[in-house]
């Protein structure tokens, strides 16, 4: 006869491991008992359990409540046992010793591999600001046994670097994603992808990129100077910029206070019916936590009466 077992039994942390040991004997042969022991090199063999053909399973103190026989129906030639709730410390070599009649004793070894699935964590880097050089966007760390694989999934252009730390029964892998921040990256997803044989599917953690920037400011509303004449209603100036975080707007007049009746509504400066008093230099001040910008424009309100008077003067002067 001979023993049938597996070279390697693989289970995920917390699962039950079936340690197989089946005696394939000739007819009439009987199994008297099967002794299971931990057989790691460097340690004395540590008994797990003894499975007796007549008297069932007797478990060692160290494995009390954790070693069981597989559920019925049971073959009298099957010396397999179940190791409940596998932990990392269970990983190693196991030996089954089978006493048979009349063929004598047989033994076989197997290796139990306990997969420890990783629990990845993603840590964003320092605040990203446009104009910085190569900067850490995020790092992703996953520890497991065996070592997990950590990669990145993103449309953003960048570079990755990985390092691994080996512990006694596991390994921690950290991958960093570096990029040169630009405003086009704002709102883009950066996803850490962790692969491991103990996971049914890859684990993904997504980080949304935030790049601080502030665009140059400009003022719209003066495209047609002829529209800025005395008496015109609904005249307005709009300050244009964009940024992250979204900027705030402030309007001032360089050559004095804002005329009465002029309304500030965020990025917009609204005028009452125009008078020549509204002529002047207006400044839009745009700012966010990252930076500030200014844009100034000169408003020249035309007075048709003044113009015609000047023409008369000119005529008379000629």
């Amino acid at each position: 006869g001979e023993l049938e077992t597996s070279d390697v039994v693989t289970v995920v942390l917390g699962q039950d491991a079936k340690l197989p040991c089946f005696y394939r004997g000739d007819s009439g042969e009987q199994v008297g008992q099967v002794a299971w022991a931990r057989a790691d090199a460097g340690e004395g063999a540590q008994e797990l359990a003894l499975l007796h053909s007549k008297y069932g399973l007797h478990v060692s103190p160290a494995y009390e409540g954790r070693v069981e026989q597989p559920p019925p129906p049971r073959n009298p030639l099957d010396g397999s046992v179940l190791l409940r709730n596998a932990v990392q410390a269970d990983e190693g070599e196991y030996e089954c010793r089978v006493s048979t009649f009349p063929a004598g004793s047989f033994q076989a070894r197997l290796r139990l591999r306990v997969l420890v699935p990783p629990l990845p964590s993603l840590n964003p880097g320092p605040a990203l600001e446009e104009g910085q050089g190569l900067t850490l966007a995020a790092s992703c760390t996953a520890e497991g046994s065996p070592a997990p694989s950590v990669t990145w999934d993103t449309e953003v252009k960048g570079t990755t670097s990985s390092r691994s730390f080996k512990h006694s029964r596991s390994a921690a892998v950290t991958s960093e994603f570096h990029l040169v921040p630009s405003r086009s990256m704002n709102g883009q997803p950066l996803t850490c992808v962790v692969s491991h044989p103990g996971l049914l599917q890859d684990q993904r953690i997504t980080h949304i990129l935030h790049v601080s920037f502030l665009a140059e400011a400009s003022v719209r509303g003066l495209e047609d100077q002829n529209l800025w004449h005395v008496g015109r209603e609904g005249a307005m100036l709009k300050c244009l910029s964009e940024g992250q975080p979204p900027p705030s707007y402030n309007w001032t007049r360089l050559d004095g206070p804002l005329p009465s009746g002029v309304r500030v509504d965020g990025d917009t400066l609204g005028f009452p019916p125009l008078t020549t008093e509204h002529s002047g230099i207006y400044v839009c001040h745009v700012s966010n936590e990252f930076s500030s910008r200014d844009s100034q424009v000169t408003v020249d309100v035309l007075d048709p009466q003044e113009d015609s008077g000047k023409q008369v003067d000119l005529v008379s002067a000629s």
Partner: antibody, heavy 122, light 111 residues
Framework: QVQLVQSGAEVKKPGASVKVSCKAS????????IHWVRQAPGQGLEWMGI????????SSAQKFQGRVTMTRDTSTSTVYMELSSLRSEDTAVYYC???????????????WGQGTLVTVSS | QSVLTQPPSVSEAPRQRVTISCSGS????????VNWYQQLPGKAPKLLIY???LLPSGVSDRFSGSKSGTSASLAISGLQSEDEADYYC???????????FGGGTKLTVLG
Amino acid sequence: QVQLVQSGAEVKKPGASVKVSCKASGYTFTSYYIHWVRQAPGQGLEWMGIINPISGRTSSAQKFQGRVTMTRDTSTSTVYMELSSLRSEDTAVYYCAKEGVGGELLRAFDIWGQGTLVTVSS
Amino acid sequence: QSVLTQPPSVSEAPRQRVTISCSGSSSNIGNNAVNWYQQLPGKAPKLLIYYDDLLPSGVSDRFSGSKSGTSASLAISGLQSEDEADYYCAAWDDSLNGFVFGGGTKLTVLG
């Protein structure tokens, strides 16, 4: 060699407690259960209880429940049995015994301590 | 009153064969292994037979064990004076969840 060495004889008054020690050597202490068995003068053997030396979990005969406490100290490979509320009929030789046979996990006692005589007398 | 029943004493002449019986129930002998212990005067018990019929190393093959149903027996052949001792049978009891012993049998080697 494998052996269990017990503490010396004790004389106690009724109502008192006694604590007997059993020091194991020559084998992996945490790998085998330890049992306590007593024998009154001229009487037979009586099983008292069992202790798991790695977890400290115990189980005792119904007769002794509430009176017997079994503990262990893995750092010194020593098991203790304390019997409280002693009465004259507790006068006996108390033995500790290792379960297993020649390293195999069998329900039999292959190694016994030399015994500790506990005399309960007023 | 012991859970397992043994004769209080047996005697036989040297070089003869003697048998000691041990009777129990389905919760102990019927379902579990029987062990036999020898206790010489003033000494701790010594394992003689385990798992019904197996001999630990160092025990003379003059000793043998057997079991049938809820009874077990210990046989000693070629009796010698040093075999004079108390003999105890023991088994785990599923109902009591503990070991049970017989009351012991005193063997006297005559002559």
